[in-house]
Interface confidence: low
Amino acid sequence: MNGSEYFVKIQSFLGGAPTEDLKALSQQNVSMDLATFMKLRTDAVLPLTVAEVQKLLGPHVEGLKAEERHRPVRDWILRQRQDDLDTLGLGLQGGIPNGYLVLDLSMQEALSGTPCLLGP
């Protein structure tokens, strides 16, 4: 069974998938469509790297621009380094500026909804 066929079989269960499952899927050439991606749990999507999302979505990564103001894409963008977002070539804006450090202060992030940044 190839990646696309496997994805079709598990598609209906993906809404509640944890980050670990999404990371594993990104290695299996599944080409997740954007409608499915948009239904994923925000907390599961946030830890994914730009490279992992690119592999997870395949050709559909080019549709992220259309969803950049909607969750979970909006929140995921806020967690990525702008340099990394730029590699997608989609004009996605709102990433962490170059030279900033991201502090994993989970409590503050839970309260504010955004990561804590330290300037350069």
């Epitope: 190839n2 990646g3 696309s4 066929e5 079709v8 050439n29 080409s31 469509d33 395949g58 050709p59 559909h60 080019e62 549709g63 621009k65 259309a66 730029d86 590699t87 997608l88 070539g89 989609l90 004009g91």
Partner: antibody, heavy 120, light 107 residues
Framework: QVQLQQPGTELVKPGASVKLSCKAS????????MHWVKQRPGQGLEWIGG????????NYNEKFRTKATLTVDKSSTTADMQLSSLTSEDSAVYYC?????????????WGQGTLVTVSG | DIVMTQSQKFMSTSGGDRVSVTCKAS??????VAWYQQKPGQSPKALIY???YRYSGVPDRFTGSGSGTDFILTISNVQSEDLAEYFC?????????FGGGTKLEIK
Amino acid sequence: QVQLQQPGTELVKPGASVKLSCKASGYTFTTFWMHWVKQRPGQGLEWIGGVNPTNGGTNYNEKFRTKATLTVDKSSTTADMQLSSLTSEDSAVYYCAPHYISSRPGFAYWGQGTLVTVSG
Amino acid sequence: DIVMTQSQKFMSTSGGDRVSVTCKASQNVGTNVAWYQQKPGQSPKALIYSASYRYSGVPDRFTGSGSGTDFILTISNVQSEDLAEYFCQQYNSYPLTFGGGTKLEIK
């Protein structure tokens, strides 16, 4: 409005190379990958590959990996495709088309195409 | 690679008729299919995306349907300007692939 300007014809000799251009206007050039499609006379469409206008990254159809080289010039909002070691099999119309533009998947806009004729 | 098969190379119809152009994918592509119309000497024109959504400006007599592996482009009340070749395309996975095309002829 979106416009994609391509030269009408190119006449080249077997074994030579040719560089085709696609001048884009009417949208933010760096926001959408530019793709290239081949159509031989009286035949169907073949996807050659796409290029990321932000950083020049490419994604090729394996069939064309050694035949085509895709590049971009952000300053002139132009995408180029160089075809090398030309044979009669390369005689075709070549189209450029941005993907996922206007938040819609697929190729909503196409250039007029460049007819390449390989003839000794 | 995913192969998109349009088994009918030619279809003949009369003005005002309803015609269905079919396309079959070699594996499940969900609804990640687009349809294009190409008139002689012109660039392809996008008609349908995501299997069933019309691009803006496309007449509502063009309707797309299907999911998984089987897709249909239906043209109702065929007009003389619909004389063209129609291609399906999948964008579910790389490489992006097109069907071989179906030429619509008006009787």
